[in-house]
């Protein structure tokens, strides 16, 4: 049942194809699961800043830290990918900056363009020199945890040494781990001590140990792979927008809203609205009118423009947008003043951005 | 896990109506559309229409518009299709699928035969 | 309604080959298209998204590309779990309109 009462015949799905609008990008920064990501809040003279992920606050944890205009993230994981905003609470305003984080692993990409530099981890020793196994490059190992998007392709690498030259075999959760074990095997690239596993799937989480050994010893090393499932998502309404605004009879006003969606976006501007004096019909829902969606005869569709305001467009003014997959919405105020009173700060009214979900 | 799952099987009179329903667990309901299509015997996919559980906006193919009722009941996680004025080439296996369509019901056979 | 063209209805093709299925938009739907797999007695499953992105766990395998009116699917090495009947689908506007099928059998 739906909750609302179209006031005028304007279908919520339009039949005509929408014109692909140019949805907002922000900037994107980029990090590896593992690393630490530091981003500053682009905006000058902040009194307090806050932060929001996908539109919902963001706090401390063990992992992401909050000093003054800097965000850290310890450690990244693809769950971290997203959109960011830094919000600004001035005295008199407030601002919002938005970014997006994309956690990928360069060494998780599916090419192995990095095994040109496998060479030097084959180390040739003098046949006089028994040795017992040791790593020849812990750097490319520090990483322990790989979290990577499913259907992406994984290398774990052990370069080692000894002599004679040890034997590399491969252990998943401590049992041997055998072609059969997956859909489609892995390869083991011995010269380059390197395990393969490509499209990864989540039954291909767990702990993955290299063990290299000769008959003088045996040393081992522990990856833990995580696969994060990737999937198409509903709209992203940039957090604080539309903003409330404030403006006198016969004045002009600008709402926006800023979507983020991989799949075509039905906007739609809808308002709150009275008939025969009422603003609920009999079944007990709004009255809404949809002023402007987006499609074949539609500018702009995430602006709303309003031009020789009256007091009767005062009240609340939604973004509703809608893809294949689901919807999201966001909503402000515009309060209108008399003419003689000239706009001053803000109305402060608390928007539910849930309103209509 | 994510799992959508679907009334059984139903043999209708032509005039008479159906109505599928689909219960899903494992995800937030209320997230998500939910689509209904259909898969006539031999023949290929046709999308019938959708609802957003959270508020019940439904959306429409034109082809079934006044036949098909799309309708969800957020307490218990679950999507309705039903079909009405039923006729013999309504026969058709009916999947529900959530919004991104990668998850789906395992379909309903309805046959409609006199 | 977006018509969506699927060629071709039907192919033979050996394990091991590369087969390509097309599909055309009666308009341009940007990449908001989808390819399903369905194989008898089951339903749909999800490939690919977004004209060219992976599911989660479907082989590397499967790929699509294309934008606008004109999208390929590929599967570069053909297995004998790929026989199936392929659909690819616009989700752009609706009514969400699929292609009538490739039916890919193993010669």
């Known amino acids: 049942r739906p909750s609302f009462s179209l006031v005028e015949d304007t279908t919520l799905e339009p039949e005509e194809p929408p014109t692909k609008y140019q949805i907002s990008q922000p900037e994107v920064y980029v990090a590896a699961p593992g690393e630490s990501l530091e981003v500053r809040c682009l905006l000058k003279d902040a009194a307090v800043i806050s932060w929001t992920k996908d539109g919902v606050h963001l706090g401390p944890n063990n992992r992401t830290v909050l000093i003054g205009e800097y965000l850290q993230i310890k450690g990244a994981t693809p769950r971290d990918s997203g959109l960011y905003a830094c919000t600004a609470s001035r005295t008199v305003d407030s601002e919002t900056w938005y970014f997006m984080v994309n956690v990928t692993d360069a060494i998780s990409s599916g090419d192995d363009e990095d095994d040109t530099d496998g060479a030097e981890d084959f180390v040739s020793e003098n046949s006089n020199n028994k040795r017992a196994p040791y790593w020849t490059n812990t750097e490319k190992m520090e990483k322990r945890l790989h979290a990577v998007p499913a259907a992406n392709t994984v290398k774990f690498r052990c370069p080692a040494g000894g002599n004679p030259m040890p034997t590399m075999r491969w252990l998943k959760n401590g049992k041997e781990f055998k072609q059969e074990h997956r859909i489609g095997g892995y390869k083991v690239r011995n010269q380059h001590w390197s395990l393969i596993m490509e499209s990864v799937v989540p039954s291909d989480k767990g702990n993955y140990t290299c063990v290299v050994e000769n008959e003088y010893g045996s040393i081992n090393h522990t990856y833990h792979l995580d696969v994060v499932e990737r999937s198409p998502h509903r709209p992203i309404l940039q957090a604080g927008l539309p903003a409330n605004a404030s403006t006198v009879v016969g004045g002009d006003v600008e709402f926006v809203c800023k979507v983020y969606s991989d799949a075509q976006p039905h906007i739609q501007w809808i308002k709150h609205v009275e008939k025969n004096g009422s603003k609920y019909g009999p079944d007990g829902l709004p009255y809404l009118k949809v002023l402007k969606h987006s499609g074949i005869n539609s500018s702009n569709a995430e602006v709303l423009a309003l031009f020789n305001v009256t007091e009767a467009d005062a009240g609340e003014y939604i973004c509703k947008v809608s893809n294949y997959i689901g919807q999201a919405n966001q909503s402000a105020w515009l309060t209108v003043l008399p003419k003689q009173q000239a706009p001053g700060r803000e109305k402060e009214i608390t928007a539910s951005p849930d309103y209509l979900e | 896990q994510v799992q959508l799952v679907q009334s059984g099987a139903e043999v209708k009179k032509p005039g008479s109506s159906v109505k599928v329903s689909c219960k899903a667990s494992?995800?937030?309901?209320?997230?998500?559309?939910v689509h209904w299509v259909r898969q006539a015997p031999g023949q290929g996919l046709e999308w019938i229409g959708s609802?957003?559980?959270?508020?019940?906006?439904?959306s429409y193919n034109q082809n079934y518009r006044g036949r098909a009722t799309i309708t969800a009941d957020k307490s218990t996680s679950t999507a309705y299709m039903e079909l009405s004025s039923l006729r013999s080439e309504d026969t058709a296996v009916y999947y529900c699928?959530?919004?991104?369509?990668?998850?789906w019901g395992q379909g309903t056979l309805v046959t409609v035969s006199s | 309604d977006i018509q969506m063209t699927q060629s071709p209805s039907s192919l033979s093709a050996s394990v091991g080959d590369r087969v390509t299925i097309t599909c055309r938009g009666s308009?341009?739907?940007?990449?908001?298209i989808a390819w399903y797999q369905q194989k008898p007695g089951k339903a749909p499953k999800l490939l690919i998204y977004?004209?060219?992105y992976r599911y989660s766990g479907v082989p590397s395998r499967f790929s699509g590309s294309g934008s606008g009116t004109d999208f390929t699917f590929t599967i570069s090495s053909l297995q004998p779990e790929d026989i199936a009947t392929y659909y690819c689908?616009?989700?752009?506007?609706?009514?969400?309109?699929f292609g009538q099928g490739t039916k890919l059998e193993i010669k």
């Open positions: 699928a959530r919004g991104d369509f990668a998850y």
């Open positions: 494992g995800y937030i309901f209320t997230s998500y559309n």
């Open positions: 609802i957003y559980p959270d508020n019940g906006d439904s």
């Open positions: 308009n341009g739907i940007s990449n908001d």
């Open positions: 977004s004209a060219s």
């Open positions: 689908q616009q989700h752009s506007t609706t009514p969400y309109t």
